[in-house]
């Protein structure tokens, strides 16, 4: 994939961040060890990442969350990565889903969810999850990134 | 990635060792169903994989292992992802943190890493883990690898 | 890897299907939103991956389950990516293995497989599970791919 | 940075009560739980009780359910345990715990101790 300049490299890297809020969208930003290797990918309202150039692209997230059973909703938690095309609807691409540990008060689990997708110029790819406030933001917990084919 | 003689593939993947050294990071073998594409990319005193060339790498790690509440810490199982750069300090690229079971004797887990990185020529990679006794090492269940975007 | 007629891109990633056949190999099918690059790589019978080009891929799996541990027998649910290469014995990729959870009536959990290996023209990989009636079908939760580097 | 400072702690006798306090302060985006955890010489550090922010549930340990409970008030970021009937075995450092910004904070401790 090292590429001449009609092919460049694009790839991105990007952390969690918390925030105050209330959507179930997980919010991201450039900062630690995150990669954004040109102009063609980008991070948009810290919350998704677009590209601009159509082809195949893994896409990947890790979500480590701390959640108690008793405290929660029978639902177990869920992370979604999502796909939103210019003037298409939002599609899930890809889902994982954990039940709530009996730890007390929290016990944490990991998920990571990949795939290839095709995607066209405009489109973004974001994360949804069922709780944010459950959502793990140490160093290198959670994390979100895309790779062109 | 087809490349040509100045662009040959990258890519490694190793297959986890019991080892009866004390410390925390984990230990690789070239065995079994390996990857080591050529010389650009090596497997050092079984621990770390380094790389002779900078760019973009997707990174991971897959760790396996059996625990107990009872039996462990309260702190979680947590498998780090780290990077150690010439010169510089080690850093946490990826974790992942994983409860303990109350599963008896112990409750296996799969814990998976991802993600994309720049890496400077002479960069290595090696995976830490909270307790390594608790790690499986049958076929297939802990593995470590990169590729070169 | 945007790549000439000569080396052009593959890539596939299929969605898991129900099936009332009783084998542990998981079913999948090119519907929702999969991909398949060309005839390079094709899904064969609805169970495994099939490529004609000789080369590194990173292949992966991701299957969601929900279980028991009461209505299960001892041992974890485990996921394995295996490999058939025309005239070898199949053999085990990667594995992952989660212990049943304690909720009832079953608890959900997500697996992720990935890694890169060699593949010669005409191998297959496909995923087996200890128990398919226990996988999770619902839109993204279970899937399975491969590009080649 | 956020901080957990807990208050309410001393010496009370057996059968007696205290309330304590902890407050989170700083930039506070997210709060799943507040709680408390103890620690008594030469032992493990234990879950005592959590309130979790979204719904008001709470959670105990076995060994106080019935003589403790766990409140807060979520405009002031701060939780309260009030401790009733209180035994010997109930002296420890009591820490008070939370998952604030998506991350274990911990306060610096607060002793209690339960003798005649």
């Known amino acids: 994939m090292q590429k001449g300049d009609q092919n460049p490299q694009i790839a991105a890297h990007v952390i969690s961040e918390a925030s105050s809020k209330t959507t179930s969208v997980l919010q991201w930003a450039e900062k630690g060890y995150y990669t954004m290797s040109n102009n063609l990918v980008t991070l948009e309202n810290g919350k998704q990442l677009t590209v601009k150039r159509q082809g195949l692209y893994y896409i990947y997230a890790q979500v480590t969350f701390c959640s108690n059973r008793e405290a929660s909703s029978q639902a177990p938690f869920i992370a979604s990565l999502c796909l939103k095309s210019p003037g298409r609807f939002e599609r899930i691409l890809l889902r994982a889903a954990n039940t709530h540990s009996s730890a007390k008060p929290c016990g944490q689990q990991s998920i990571h969810l990949g795939g290839v997708f095709e995607l066209q110029p405009g489109a973004s790819v974001f994360v949804n999850v069922t709780d944010p406030s459950q959502v793990s933001h140490g160093t290198g917990f959670t994390s979100f990134g895309l790779l062109k084919l | 990635m087809q490349k040509g003689d100045q662009n040959p593939q990258i890519a490694a993947h190793v297959i986890s060792e019991a080892s009866s050294k004390t410390t925390s990071v984990l230990q690789w073998a070239e065995k079994g169903y390996y990857t080591m594409s050529n010389n650009l990319v090596t497997l050092e005193n079984g621990k770390q994989l380094t790389v002779k060339r900078q760019g973009l790498y997707y990174i991971y790690a897959q760790v396996t292992f059996c625990s107990n509440r009872e039996a462990s810490s309260q702190a979680p199982f947590i498998a780090s992802l780290c990077l150690k750069s010439p010169g510089r300090f080690e850093r946490i690229l990826l974790r992942a943190a994983n409860t303990h079971s109350s599963a008896k004797p112990c409750g296996q887990q799969s814990i998976h890493l991802g993600g994309v990185f720049e890496l400077q020529p002479g960069a290595s990679v090696f995976v830490n883990v909270t307790d390594p006794s608790q790690v499986s090492h049958g076929t297939g269940f802990t593995s470590f690898g990169l590729l070169k975007l | 890897m945007q790549k000439g007629d000569q080396n052009p891109q593959i890539a596939a990633h299929v969605i898991s299907e129900a099936s009332s056949k009783t084998t542990s190999v998981l079913q999948w099918a090119e519907k929702g939103y999969y991909t398949m690059s060309n005839n390079l790589v094709t899904l064969e019978n609805g169970k495994q991956l099939t490529v004609k080009r000789q080369g590194l891929y990173y292949i992966y799996a991701q299957v969601t389950f929900c279980s028991n541990r009461e209505a299960s027998s001892q041992a974890p649910f485990i996921a394995s990516l295996c490999l058939k290469s025309p005239g070898r014995f199949e053999r085990i990729l990667l594995r992952a293995a989660n212990t049943h959870s304690s909720a009832k009536p079953c608890g959900q959990q997500s697996i992720h497989l990935g890694g890169v290996f060699e593949l010669q023209p005409g191998a297959s990989v496909f995923v087996n599970v200890t128990d398919p009636s226990q996988v999770s079908h619902g839109t993204g939760f279970t899937s399975f791919g491969l590009l080649k580097l | 940075e956020v901080q957990l400072v807990e208050s309410g702690g001393g010496l009370v006798q057996p059968g007696g009560s205290l309330r304590l306090s902890c407050a989170a302060s700083?930039?506070?985006?997210?709060?799943?739980?507040m709680g408390w955890f103890r620690q008594a010489p030469g032992k493990e550090r234990e879950f005592v009780a959590a309130?979790?922010?979204?719904?008001?549930?709470?959670q105990y340990a076995d060994s106080v359910k019935g003589r403790f409970t766990i409140s807060a008030d979520n405009s002031k970021n701060t939780a309260y345990l009030q401790m009733n009937s209180l035994k010997p075995e109930d002296t420890a450092v009591y820490y008070c715990?939370?998952?604030?910004?998506?991350?274990?904070?911990w306060g610096q401790g607060t002793l209690v101790t339960v003798s005649s």
């Open positions: 715990a939370a998952w604030l910004n998506g991350g274990n904070r």
């Open positions: 700083g930039r506070i985006f997210s709060t799943y739980f």
């Open positions: 309130i979790y922010w979204s719904n008001g549930k709470t």
